[in-house]
Interface confidence: low
């Protein structure tokens, strides 16, 4: 067969859809691989062809577009299932071609089952709400294009297994779910079920997302360095191990990068000719405030090392802070016999 630009299996787009629900899947070629859209390709005389490989099979086969009630159909660059079946799971390929040009990409489609409480192996998107921040909304995701704007669907919202009715601070408003004041107790999985008619049939779209209540920007502060501090002195003799923890608290900030690093004599440890190791651990509070600890370790410290400046730095979107550790060389304990002898004026 003639050469075709094969983009391979696009595992980045692991598409999951629920069994017995409509699914519309756009050919990824136009979204991620080619620099033109379907309309341009179509008007240039290119044809979009779909085929698939069933789960646990190697054989590529055409998609059957002649099923009863047009269960599977193609519309422009979209492959439609009305509805999906469990055995639709497999790798799907869309190929764009004419006599001189060919480009194709495959992607995995997994049809998953859900129980009556909407539990399933589906990977859930996470939506973060600020704690005690005033009205915030989540929107029923990925329902565009399933029905025309003239169709008015019914939308039912659930928290876990329970229909959201008469909840204190959570109000369904059509496609939106409003949180009057988000609290930790609002953490959980929220499901919208969109029901709409089409050609005498009724279809359901189920969309579940995880709500995570996080720290509010109203309460956000610059990083706080708990250690090193002015109360602890790292007093060591040459040859001992020097361990200095840098522990920093970061307020939750959406899309913020939290960074902690050490400098030794104003340089990054990598740029200093001493054998230093740094180990990091991270923990999170219930509202995703973060505590990072970086432990600076010098196995066998020298008297030169004990004269250096050790500074812990931290930064987030709220600012940058730094704190120096108090490091000093331990004064050797007096040798008792010599001291005593000297005290008695012995020669």
């Amino acid at each position: 067969s003639e050469r075709c630009d094969d983009w391979g299996l696009d595992t980045m787009r692991q598409i999951q859809v629920f069994e017995d629900e409509p699914a519309r899947i756009k050919c990824p070629l136009f979204e991620h691989f080619l620099k033109f859209n379907y309309s341009t390709a179509h008007s240039a005389g290119l044809t979009l062809i779909w085929y698939w490989t069933r789960q646990d099979r190697d054989l590529e086969e055409p998609i059957n577009f002649r099923l009863p009630e047009n269960r599977i159909s193609k519309e422009k660059d979209v492959l439609w299932f009305r509805p999906t079946l469990l055995n639709d799971t497999g790798n799907y390929t869309c190929m764009l071609r004419n006599t001189t040009y060919c480009s194709k990409v495959a992607f995995p489609l997994e049809v998953v089952q859900k129980d009556s409480c909407f539990n399933s192996p589906m990977k859930l998107p996470v939506h973060k709400l600020y704690i005690e921040y005033g009205i915030q909304r989540i929107t029923c995701p990925n329902v565009d294009g399933y029905f025309p704007s003239s169709v008015k669907p019914t939308i039912t919202w659930y928290m876990g297994c329970y229909k959201i009715q008469n909840f204190n601070n959570v109000i369904p408003e059509g496609m939106n779910l409003s949180f009057l004041i988000a609290l930790i107790s609002n953490n959980g999985n929220y499901t919208c079920v969109v029901t709409y008619p089409e050609n005498g049939r009724t279809f359901h779209l189920t969309r579940t997302l995880t709500v995570k209540v996080v720290g509010s920007p109203k309460n956000a502060v610059p990083p706080v360095i708990h250690s090193p501090n002015d109360h602890v002195v790292y007093e060591k003799e040459p040859g001992e191990e020097l361990l200095i923890p840098c522990t920093v608290y970061f307020s939750f900030l959406m899309d913020s990068r939290n960074e902690v690093w050490w400098t030794i004599d104003g340089k990054k440890p990598d740029d200093i000719t001493i054998d230093v190791t740094i180990n990091e651990s991270i923990s999170h509070s219930r509202t995703e405030d973060e505590t990072r600890t970086q432990i600076l370790s010098i196995k066998k410290v020298t008297s030169e090392d004990l004269k250096r400046s050790y500074v812990c730095h931290a930064r987030s979107a709220k600012g940058e802070v730094a704190k120096a550790a108090k490091v000093k060389q331990k004064v050797p304990a007096p040798r008792y016999t010599v001291e005593l002898a000297c005290g008695f004026g012995a020669t």
Epitope: P217, V221, S256, R257, E259, A317, G319, E320
Partner: antibody, heavy 123, light 112 residues
Framework: HVQLQQSGPELVRPGASVKLSCKAS????????MNWVKQRPGQGLEWVGQ????????YYNELFEGKATLTVDTSSNTAYMHLTSLTSEDSAVYYC????????????????WGQGTSLTVSS | DIVLTQSPISLAVFLGQRATISCRAS??????????MHWYQQKAGQPPKLLIK???DLESGVPVRFSGSGSGTDFILNIHPVEVEDIATYYC??????????FGGGTKLEIK
């Protein structure tokens, strides 16, 4: 959509003071730094300072310490700049400008600007 | 404080040609990943408008004929092809570290 609406032109006497306002809409006011920028006629741009509405934290250009005071009223989503002991050197257009918030390391760009307030200091 | 030096002070180019504006910082405004350098366009009687942030990120809605490059201390704004509506003064701006933020002196773009 994001809008920054500034107060109208001001004509004041030397030695007096003035308070310029900048009303924000279309975004969560308290989560973005608000900056003030000065531009004298035919001249370039000069950063005056910035304020973080959620905490009231301020930073000033050293040249404007004691000259400008930045405040906010979070109930009305309004930022203010109070200028004192005015001289002809303070005659300029003053802009408020928001910094895009979601980049760490203090690398904030001024992504939305008010239309500017013209201040004329003259006897 | 970081000083930004823009050049040239003014620039006249033919329509459809390339305009190149340079901005040099007195010290580095880059860290691993990106640079805290931004470019603005100011037309007569209007407030400045953000064109490019972090040296090369085109702001939403800005035509692709504008592009930015550079890191460390040396940065470039390119406009190609220049159109009549691009007549304006262009400013670079750094926002490195704890403010003090500064602007370049500006470059006035005219059409020949």
């Amino acid at each position: 959509h994001v809008q920054l609406q500034q107060s109208g032109p001001e004509l004041v006497r030397p030695g007096a003071s003035v308070k310029l306002s900048c009303k924000a809409s279309g975004y969560i006011f308290i989560t973005y730094w608000m900056n003030w920028v000065k531009q004298r006629p035919g001249q370039g741009l000069e950063w005056v300072g910035q304020i973080f509405p959620a905490s009231g934290t301020t930073y000033y250009n050293e040249l404007f310490e004691g000259k400008a005071t930045l405040t906010v009223d979070t109930s009305s989503n309004t930022a203010y700049m109070h200028l004192t002991s005015l001289t002809s050197e303070d005659s300029a257009v003053y802009y408020c400008a928001r910094t895009d918030f979601y980049r760490y390391d203090g690398g904030y760009a001024l992504d939305y600007w008010g239309q500017g307030t013209s201040l004329t200091v003259s006897s | 404080d970081i000083v930004l030096t823009q050049s040239p002070i003014s620039l006249a180019v033919f329509l459809g040609q390339r305009a190149t504006i340079s901005c040099r910082a007195s010290q580095s405004v880059s860290t691993s990943g990106y640079s805290s350098m931004h470019w603005y366009q100011q037309k007569a009687g209007q407030p400045p408008k953000l064109l490019i942030k972090y040296a090369s990120d085109l702001e939403s809605g800005v035509p692709v004929r504008f592009s930015g490059s550079g890191s460390g201390t040396d940065f470039i704004l390119n406009i190609h092809p220049v159109e009549v509506e691009d007549i304006a003064t262009y400013y670079c701006h750094h926002s490195w570290g704890i403010p003090m933020y500064t602007f370049g002196g500006g470059t006035k773009l005219e059409i020949k």
